[in-house]
C-alpha cells in the first residue's frame, strides 16, 4: 500500500525551500529494500528534471521555477521496485498542482475595434462588443477582466456606456448627432482582478451613421430670371440649398419640384449631383405673346425619405421664382407645321429619282412671307429618299423605292425639313408627309396587232397584256389628249375585255405616227405614263402591201397628224 502526500507549488517562485514537496513510501519498505522511481512531464519528459526523487526515501524535490500557464499541474508516475527490479505496488499517479499568480495582463482581440451606429438611435442600443482574454487561471480573480472607458473623443457629454463585465458598448443617450460628431474614439481599459489588477488599453472607433434628419433649405427666399421667348435653356437658374446631412448621400441629395406655376410644363429642375444645386431648365419654349411672366413656386426634399424622428415636422415650404419672358423678333417657322405631298397615281416605284414633290418653304413670322436668308436641309429622312434644295426648298426624290419598304407606313413616308436662319443659326423644323400610291410596277401594256397599216384603211387592233395577274380585265382604252390646236386624228373603240380598235378618223398621209394610249383596269389601276404606240401608215399597192418605209426618228415623225417639218 502506498503512503503519499504532495504540496501545491506556486508558479514563478522558488519552491525548493519547501522540499520535499511530495513524499511516497510503500509499506513493503518495512520488510525489504525498496527503490523509488518517478517519471512523467517535468522528470523524464520536457521540461526535464524539474522533479527528482530520493530513490531510498521516496522524497520528491522541486528543482526549478514553474509556469502555471505552461503547465497547470504535473502528473508524476511513481513506482516502488524490489531488489529484483520488480514493482511491488501498482504505479501511482501523484498530482502536483501549480498555484496561479497574476502574472498575465488582459489581451484585447484587436488593438482597434471598429463599430457604427445610426445617429438618433435609442439609448442602450448595442454598438459593439469588446473581446479580451487573460492567460491566468480561468474563473479566478487573476483572469476576471473588468472593462471601463478611459476617455472619449470628442470629449464632453459621455455618449457611450461600456458594460464592466460583458464588454458591450451601448449608447448612453438617444442624442447621437452625426452633424455634431460624425465619429467617436474611445480609449478603453481592461483590468484583471476585476479591475484591480493588471490592465491593457485598446481603442474603439465608432462611426455615427447618417440618417435623413435634416431638411434641405433654400439659401435664398426668392429667385428671378429672364429668358427670351421661343428658346430652350439647359440652365436658366441655379438654386442653392443647405442640407446638413452627409454629403453625396441620398439623405443630402436634393429633389426639387414645382408646387405651382408650371402647368404648361415649360420647366424642369435637375439636380447637379456635384453641388446639390437645382438647375432650372426651359424644356418647352415660352411665347411672349401668350405669357409675359411666369410665377413659379418650388420646393425641395431629399432623394431619401425623412427619418421617422423628424418626418412629422416636415412641411412643404414653397419658394417663389419669377421668370420674365423677353419678347424677341420672331424668327422663321414652317406654317403649317407639316405638309403632305402626293406622288401621282401610276408613277413607277422604279422611276422616282428626280420626281418633284413641290416646295415647303419656311415663313418669316414677322412678315408672314417666305423666309429669306435661310438654308434648307433634310432632318430625319428615313430611307434617304428625299432631298431638299438648300435655297428654293424644292423637295424631290433622290432614290427609287421598294414597294415593300419598311419606311412606308399607311402608304406614307415621313421626313423632317429644317430651315436654318443664316444670320442667327436658329432652326425651324417642318414635317413632310409623302403619300405614295400602290406602285403599279407591273402595269398593263398595249401591243399592236401589226405595226404597219395602209393609208386607205388605217385601222389596227390593240391588245392589253399584263405581266402579272394583279391587273384584271376588262380594260378601258383611251387616247391621251392630242397636242393643243390639233384636231383629233385617231379614235379608239373597245372590242372586248382585252382589246380595242384604233383607227384614223380621216384620210391621213403616210408616215410614222406616235399614238399615246392610256390603259386602265377594272380597279382603276393604270400605268405611270401613257403607252406610246408607234404605227407606220404607208401607201399600199393593190395587194395591200406597204410600199414605202419611214425612219422612226426622222424629223417627219408624226404625233397624231402629219408633221409639217421645221
Amino acid at each position: 500500500e502506498w503512503v503519499k502526500f504532495a504540496k501545491p507549488c506556486r508558479e514563478g517562485e522558488d519552491n525548493s525551500k519547501r522540499n520535499p514537496i511530495a513524499k511516497i513510501t510503500s509499506d513493503y519498505q518495512a520488510t525489504q529494500k525498496i527503490t523509488y522511481r518517478i517519471s512523467g512531464v517535468g522528470i523524464d519528459q520536457p521540461p526535464f528534471g524539474i522533479f527528482v526523487v530520493d530513490k531510498n526515501t521516496g522524497d520528491i524535490n522541486i528543482t526549478a521555477i514553474v509556469d502555471r500557464e505552461e503547465t497547470p499541474s504535473f502528473l508524476i508516475t511513481c513506482r516502488a521496485l524490489n531488489a529484483q527490479g520488480l514493482d511491488v505496488e501498482k504505479p501511482l499517479i501523484l498530482t502536483v498542482k501549480i498555484l496561479d499568480i497574476n502574472d498575465n495582463p488582459p489581451v484585447f482581440s484587436q488593438q482597434i475595434f471598429m463599430g457604427e451606429i445610426e445617429e438618433n438611435s435609442a439609448s442602450n442600443s448595442l454598438v459593439m462588443i469588446l473581446n479580451a482574454t487573460d492567460a491566468d487561471e480561468p474563473n479566478h480573480l487573476n483572469s476576471k477582466i473588468a472593462f471601463k472607458i478611459v476617455s472619449q473623443e470628442p470629449a464632453g457629454t459621455p455618449m457611450f456606456l461600456l458594460s464592466r463585465n460583458t464588454g458591450e458598448v451601448r449608447t448612453l443617450t438617444n442624442s447621437l448627432d452625426r452633424e455634431q460628431a460624425s465619429s467617436y474614439r474611445l480609449v478603453v481599459s481592461g483590468a484583471d482582478k476585476d479591475g484591480e489588477g493588471l490592465s491593457t488599453q485598446c481603442e474603439c472607433n465608432i462611426k455615427v451613421k447618417d440618417v435623413n434628419d435634416n431638411f434641405p433649405m433654400f439659401r435664398d427666399s426668392q429667385y428671378s430670371a429672364r429668358i427670351e421667348e421661343n428658346i430652350l435653356s439647359s440652365e436658366l437658374l441655379r438654386f442653392q440649398v443647405t442640407d446638413l446631412d452627409e454629403e453625396y448621400t441620398d439623405n443630402w441629395l436634393a429633389v426639387y419640384f414645382f408646387t405651382s406655376g408650371n402647368e404648361g410644363n415649360w420647366f424642369e429642375i435637375q439636380t447637379d449631383p456635384r453641388t446639390n444645386e437645382g438647375i432650372l431648365k426651359v424644356v418647352k419654349a415660352l411665347d411672349y405673346e401668350q405669357l409675359q411672366s411666369v410665377k413659379l413656386s418650388i420646393a425641395v426634399k431629399n432623394k431619401a425619405e425623412f427619418h421617422q424622428s423628424v418626418i412629422s415636422r416636415y412641411r412643404v415650404q414653397s419658394t417663389p421664382v419669377t421668370i420674365q419672358v423677353i419678347n424677341v423678333r420672331e424668327g422663321i417657322a414652317f406654317r403649317p407645321a407639316s405638309k403632305t405631298f402626293t406622288v401621282q397615281k401610276g408613277i413607277s416605284s422604279k422611276k422616282l429619282v428626280d420626281y418633284i414633290l413641290g416646295t415647303y418653304q419656311a415663313i418669316d413670322e414677322d412678315t408672314n412671307k417666305a423666309a429669306s436668308n435661310v438654308k434648307y436641309v433634310m432632318g430625319r429622312n428615313d430611307g434617304g429618299y428625299l432631298m431638299i434644295d438648300s435655297k428654293t426648298a424644292e423637295i424631290k426624290f433622290v432614290k427609287n423605292m421598294n414597294r415593300d419598304s419598311t419606311f412606308i407606313v399607311n402608304k406614307t413616308i415621313t421626313a423632317e425639313v429644317l430651315a436654318i436662319d443664316e444670320y442667327t443659326g436658329k432652326t425651324s423644323t417642318g414635317t413632310v408627309y409623302v403619300r405614295v400610291p400602290d406602285f403599279n410596277d407591273n402595269c398593263p401594256t398595249a401591243v399592236l396587232e401589226k405595226d404597219a397599216v395602209c393609208s386607205s384603211s388605217p385601222s389596227v387592233v390593240v391588245s392589253a397584256r399584263t405581266l402579272n395577274n394583279r391587273y384584271t380585265g376588262p380594260y378601258t382604252f383611251a387616247l391621251e389628249d392630242q397636242p393643243v390646236k390639233l384636231p383629233a386624228v385617231w379614235s379608239i373603240t373597245t372590242l372586248n375585255a382585252t382589246s380595242a380598235l384604233l383607227r384614223a378618223q380621216e384620210q391621213i398621209p403616210p408616215g410614222v405616227y406616235h399614238i399615246s394610249l392610256v390603259l386602265t383596269d377594272s380597279q382603276n389601276n393604270r400605268c405611270e405614263m401613257p403607252r406610246s404606240l408607234t404605227l407606220e401608215v404607208c401607201q399600199c399597192d393593190n395587194r395591200g402591201i406597204c410600199g414605202t418605209s419611214y425612219p422612226t426618228t426622222s424629223p417627219g415623225t408624226r404625233y397624231g397628224r402629219p408633221h409639217s417639218g421645221r
Partner: antibody, heavy 113, light 111 residues
Framework: EVQLQQSGPELVKPGASVKISCKAS????????MHWVKQSPEKCLEWIGQ????????TYNQKFKAKATLTVDKSSSTAYMQLKSLTSEDSAVYYC??????WGQGTTLTVSS | DIVLTQSPASLAVSLGQSVTISCRAS??????????MQWYQQKPGQPPKLLIY???DVESGVPARFSGSGSGTDFSLNIHPVEEDDIAMYFC?????????FGSGTKLEIK
C-alpha cells in the same frame, strides 16, 4: 415609253444666239426636272443646269449661268435652252435628259464664221 | 465642285474577260446611306445610257454582267464577262451636289 425629241443640228456664227428645243412625251412632263448636258468634241460631259417644268424654277452650273437660259412650255411639253454670245468653245453636242434614265438624241451645235 | 477622277482613261480587254473601271470623288457622295453615283455607257453617235444608279442598282433592261460597287468616295463599275457590244465610253456621274459632275470617261476597246 419616255421619249425626248430634240431639234436638229445648228450651224451659227460667233456672237449669235441659238435656242434648242426638247419635246417630251410618254410621261408627266411637269413631274420631273429636265436637265441639260454639254458634250464637247473631247467627249467630256458637263452638266449645264436643270429646270422644274412645273414652276419654271432653274438651277444652273455657275460655269454656264451667263451662257445658258432654260425655259419650258408646259402646253407642248417642251423644254428649251438658249445659248448666247456663242464662240467656238460652245461647239458641242447638247443633250436634254430626264434625270439619267432618258436622254434626247442630242443636238449638234457648230459655231463657225 | 465635286471632282470625279476616272481611271483608266482607256483599256483593251479580251472578250469574256472581266473589267473594272474606277471612279474617285473629291468628297463623299453619300446621302443618308445611299451613294448618289451613276454609271453610263455611251456609244458613238448616241446619248449616254444609264447602267447603274445609287452606286450599285442596275437599271432595268441592263444586262446582269454589269455591276457597280463602292461608297463614300471610291466607286467601281465591273463588267463580267465583256462582250463585243460593250465597246463604248463609260462615265461616272454624281448627283449629290449641284453642279452635278461627270468623270472624264474610260474608253473600252477589244484586244
Amino acid at each position: 415609253e419616255v421619249q425626248l425629241q430634240q431639234s436638229g443640228p445648228e450651224l451659227v456664227k460667233p456672237g449669235a444666239s441659238v435656242k434648242i428645243s426638247c419635246k417630251a412625251s410618254g410621261y408627266s412632263f411637269t413631274a420631273y426636272y429636265m436637265h441639260w448636258v454639254k458634250q464637247s468634241p473631247e467627249k467630256c460631259l458637263e452638266w449645264i443646269g436643270q429646270i422644274n417644268p412645273s414652276t419654271g424654277g432653274t438651277t444652273y452650273n455657275q460655269k454656264f449661268k451667263a451662257k445658258a437660259t432654260l425655259t419650258v412650255d408646259k402646253s407642248s411639253s417642251t423644254a428649251y435652252m438658249q445659248l448666247k454670245s456663242l464662240t467656238s468653245e460652245d461647239s458641242a453636242v447638247y443633250y436634254c435628259a430626264r434625270w439619267g434614265d432618258s436622254w434626247g438624241q442630242g443636238t449638234t451645235l457648230t459655231v463657225s464664221s | 465642285d465635286i471632282v470625279l477622277t476616272q481611271s483608266p482613261a482607256s483599256l483593251a480587254v479580251s472578250l469574256g474577260q472581266s473589267v473594272t473601271i474606277s471612279c474617285r470623288a473629291s468628297e463623299s457622295v453619300e446621302y443618308y446611306g445611299t451613294s448618289l453615283m451613276q454609271w453610263y455607257q455611251q456609244k458613238p453617235g448616241q446619248p449616254p445610257k444609264l447602267l447603274i444608279y445609287g452606286a450599285s442598282d442596275v437599271e432595268s433592261g441592263v444586262p446582269a454582267r454589269f455591276s457597280g460597287s463602292g461608297s463614300g468616295t471610291d466607286f467601281s463599275l465591273n463588267i463580267h464577262p465583256v462582250e463585243e457590244d460593250d465597246i463604248a465610253m463609260y462615265f461616272c456621274q454624281q448627283s449629290r451636289k449641284v453642279p452635278y459632275t461627270f468623270g472624264s470617261g474610260t474608253k473600252l476597246e477589244i484586244k
